[in-house]
């Protein structure tokens, strides 16, 4: 069964003579391991002795004998998959078949591998792509059916020569599919490089130049032209000629087809290679080229720029912005068609000429109000002056000017008036839109810039005004000035600190919060009656008949303001005391007698203590004492003291008389 | 280790037979390949017949063929060579050789190839 044995390698194998050749190899045996192996060179079965006529160039069996040629031959194999090979130096007569003879356990093999071994080192051979197109890269691959680790070699590209700058890519392969070398090199062709020589040279390590391989190049372009022109410098007045002639330098393939294209756009009826110009206008200047086209596309030729000179057009202006803002910068533009180019302009403001603007574009860095109007410019050439144009509007706009707050009432507003006040104003661009009032209030705007304000605040300080367009501009504020009078007026107690008891020195002041105008007059009253004038009521001794009801006014030119109604109260011991006797100071025995101690007292007494006509204390604390049933030893003189926080106060003596009954009589 | 010893040989008149046998020791008999080769003096060894065991196909060598046949006996690890009708050219020891297949790409021998371990042979004489 001849699929035992499975051996893998190239087929052929190329060097050449002092070159070597490794021999990428490998086998898989039916059972075990390799026992012999024998590399025969044309190995040659003889059917009678059933033996290989050939030479031996290496021999490895199991007695170990091995040849003096197995220097330059070398088995780099193992006993069970690897049988690479290596002939250093290989020579000419090496050519023909290696026969690997291989001895495992059960069996005998003969592997056959092909040697092709050339007298000088071969050529490589350059691969191109089917077609090279102008500025597309392709890939050049030199392949060279040759590799050895013993030998080492290098593969340069030229071009006419010349070794390319391009770095090429080179790779090599000692497998058992393949053995070679190659270099491929990535490589955008123009079309000047169409019929130029690549080589590709093989060299030795050194450099040493050994075969080379030749192609010439055919790269694929589209016409490549030249256009003349008459006059060479294609500037022309109007009314002159003009001749274009377009020559091809080189078309791979042929050309087909001519045009000539102006600005991009193609002049019909003109296919030919030479461009007749009669009689020039204006209009005809431009960019002109001729286009040749062949199969892979049109070639088009450098731009002629034809100009054909003229005196300036009439001219307009550009506003670099309008309106503009006061205070912003502003850029002015003349525009006018003119070949050659103006050298000189002449600017005017409302018809006025501008000293001293020769330029282009004015340029006014600020901005002011009376830079508003109409601009216009002429421009000027060697072929002559162009016209004036319609010029240009420039409109400055700015916030409304001098701005203030008028008061239209006669002076002075007092509190409670009705007060008219308008926003006034100087000039405005654009127009004034809208008005705003500081401070904001619920007030009617009766018209534009007119404010109403009703009931009048005693507060109302100042008032200011904006005028509005697309900015406000604030008025300084106004004062309204509003007078009044006093406020918040009330009594305060100035001394003592304290509560006031009878004797003390006591002052009153009268206070106000404020008053417009300030001069003010105070007047005091008690009880409906006139006290003083002066702001404090002084008391010097205090009584408490001084105790009641104190109001203070206090008045200016606008009106009188008085205060709430402000209490004294005097605090003094118990006085005035009393014993009052109910029914009388005469009753029967058996009856009801009620005795009172009557006092004025602030506070009001808080303690009694009652007394008899020995000065004994009586066990009653009470205002009132109540005897019942009386009796006749109740008779005789009684007192009281009534006590509260400022003190005592004791009453006279009253005497209580108890008669006898008439029974207590008749028994008797 | 293969070792072989043939046996049968002998002086024969021309036209004659002989059965020469070997018997081989130390080989896996069946898969192998056998042979019977033989040198007159003074000439190269060369081969007579060969067998394939494994298929049992044969060789005869141009100037045999017809007279001499090649068999085996697997039980016995034996290899016979009947000659027949011998005539004086085929006087010369005759070797006996067992030896592994050998395969040459898809080629697979019928004889044993490079074979170099020999018996001491047998010698087969034919004369008058």
């Known amino acids: 069964d001849s699929s035992k044995w499975v051996f893998e390698h190239p087929e052929t194998l190329y060097a050449w003579e002092g070159a070597c050749v490794w021999i990428p190899c490998t086998y898989r045996a039916l059972d075990g391991d390799l026992e012999s192996f024998i590399l025969f060179h044309n190995p040659e079965y003889n059917k009678n002795t059933s033996k290989f006529d050939g030479t031996r160039l290496y021999e490895s069996t199991k007695d170990g004998k091995v040849p003096s040629e197995q220097k330059r031959v070398q088995f780099l194999g193992d006993k069970n998959k690897n049988c690479t090979l290596s002939i250093h130096p290989v020579h000419l007569n090496d050519s023909g078949q290696l026969g690997l003879r291989m001895e495992s356990k059960t069996e005998k093999w003969m592997e056959r591998i092909h040697l092709n071994v050339s007298e000088r080192p071969f050529p490589p051979h350059i691969q191109l792509p089917p077609e090279i197109q102008e500025s597309q890269e392709v890939t050049l691959t030199c392949l060279l059916n040759f590799s050895c680790y013993g030998y080492p070699i290098q593969l340069q590209w030229l071009l006419e020569g010349v070794p390319m700058r391009q770095a090429a890519v080179t790779s090599t392969s000692l497998t058992i599919k393949s053995v070679f070398t190659r270099s491929e090199l990535k490589f955008s062709p123009q079309w000047s490089h169409h019929g130029k020589i690549v080589t590709c040279q093989l060299q030795d390590a050194d450099g040493k130049f050994l075969s080379n391989d030749t192609v010439q190049l055919n790269v694929k372009h589209t016409p490549k032209l030249e256009i003349k022109v008459t006059p060479s410098d294609a500037i022309v007045r109007e009314g002159d000629s003009v001749t274009m002639t377009c020559e091809v330098s080189s078309s791979n393939p042929e050309y087909t087809t001519v045009s000539w294209l102006k600005d991009g756009t193609s002049l019909k009826k003109q296919n030919t290679f030479t461009l007749n110009l009669r009689e020039v206008t204006k209009d005809q200047s431009g960019k002109y080229c001729c286009q040749v086209s062949n199969d892979v596309g049109p070639g088009r030729s450098e731009e002629v720029f034809l100009q054909v000179q003229y005196a300036p057009e009439p001219s307009t202006v550009q506003i670099l912005h309008s309106p503009a803002v006061e205070g912003s910068q502003v850029e002015f533009l003349c525009m006018s068609l003119a070949n050659p180019l103006p050298t000189n302009y002449t600017w005017y403001h409302n018809g006025k000429e501008m000293q001293g603007r020769t330029e282009e574009k004015v340029h006014i860095p600020k901005i002011l109000p009376w830079h508003a109007g109409t601009y216009s410019c002429v421009a000027e050439n060697i072929l002559g002056t162009g016209q004036r144009g319609p010029g240009a509007e420039l409109d400055v706009q700015y916030p409304p000017k001098k701005v203030t707050t008028v008061i239209q009432n006669p002076m002075p507003i007092r509190e409670g008036d009705t007060v008219t006040l308008s926003c006034n104003y100087n000039s405005s661009n654009p127009s004034v839109t809208r008005y705003e009032w500081k401070p904001h209030g619920a007030w009617e705007e009766p018209s534009l810039g007119v404010l109403k304000i009703q009931n009048v605040g005693w507060d109302n300080t100042t008032i200011a005004c904006a005028a509005c367009n697309s900015w406000c501009s604030w008025a300084s504020p106004v004062a309204l000035n509003v007078q009044y009078a006093p406020r918040d007026v009330r009594v305060r107690k100035i001394k003592p600190l304290s509560e006031i008891h009878s004797g003390n020195s006591v002052s009153l002041q009268c206070d106000f919060s404020s008053s417009h105008p300030k001069e003010v007059q105070f007047f005091w009253e008690k009880n409906g009656r006139l006290l003083g004038k002066e702001s404090q009521l002084n008391f010097d001794s205090i009584s408490p008949e001084d105790a009641g009801s104190y109001s203070c006014w206090v008045n200016n030119s606008i009106g009188q303001t008085a205060s709430k109604a402000w209490t004294l109260e005097v605090l003094y011991a118990p006085r005035r005391l009393r014993v009052s006797m109910s029914p009388g100071d005469q009753v029967m025995e058996g009856k009801s007698a009620t005795l009172t101690c009557e006092s004025d007292a602030n506070p009001p007494v808080s303690h009694y203590t009652w007394f008899d006509w020995n000065n004994q204390s009586l066990p009653y604390h009470s205002q009132k004492l109540r005897l019942e049933p009386v009796k006749v030893q109740h008779s005789g003189a009684y007192w009281c003291q009534g006590t509260n926080s400022v003190g005592k106060g004791r009453s006279p003596l009253s005497t209580l008389t108890v008669y006898y009954s008439p029974e207590t009589i008749g028994r008797r | 280790q293969v070792k072989l010893e043939e046996s049968g040989g002998g002086l024969v008149q021309p036209g004659g037979s002989l059965r020469l046998s070997c018997t081989v020791s130390?080989?896996?008999?069946?898969?192998?390949?056998m042979g019977w080769f033989r040198q007159a003096p003074g000439k190269e060894r060369e081969v007579v017949s060969c067998?394939?065991?494994?298929?049992?196909?044969?060789y005869y060598a141009d100037s045999v063929k017809g007279r001499f046949t090649i068999s085996r006996d697997n039980a016995k690890n034996t290899v016979y060579l009947q000659m027949n009708s011998l005539k004086p050219d085929d006087t010369a020891i005759y070797y006996c050789?067992?030896?592994?297949?050998?395969?040459?790409?898809?080629?697979?021998?019928?004889?044993?190839?490079?074979?170099?371990?020999w018996g001491q042979g047998t010698q087969v004489t034919v004369s008058s």
């Open positions: 050789a067992v030896d592994k297949p050998f395969y040459d790409g898809g080629n697979y021998y019928t004889c044993p190839v490079d074979f170099d371990s």
């Open positions: 067998m394939r065991n494994s298929d049992g196909v044969t």
């Open positions: 130390g080989v896996t008999f069946d898969y192998y390949v």
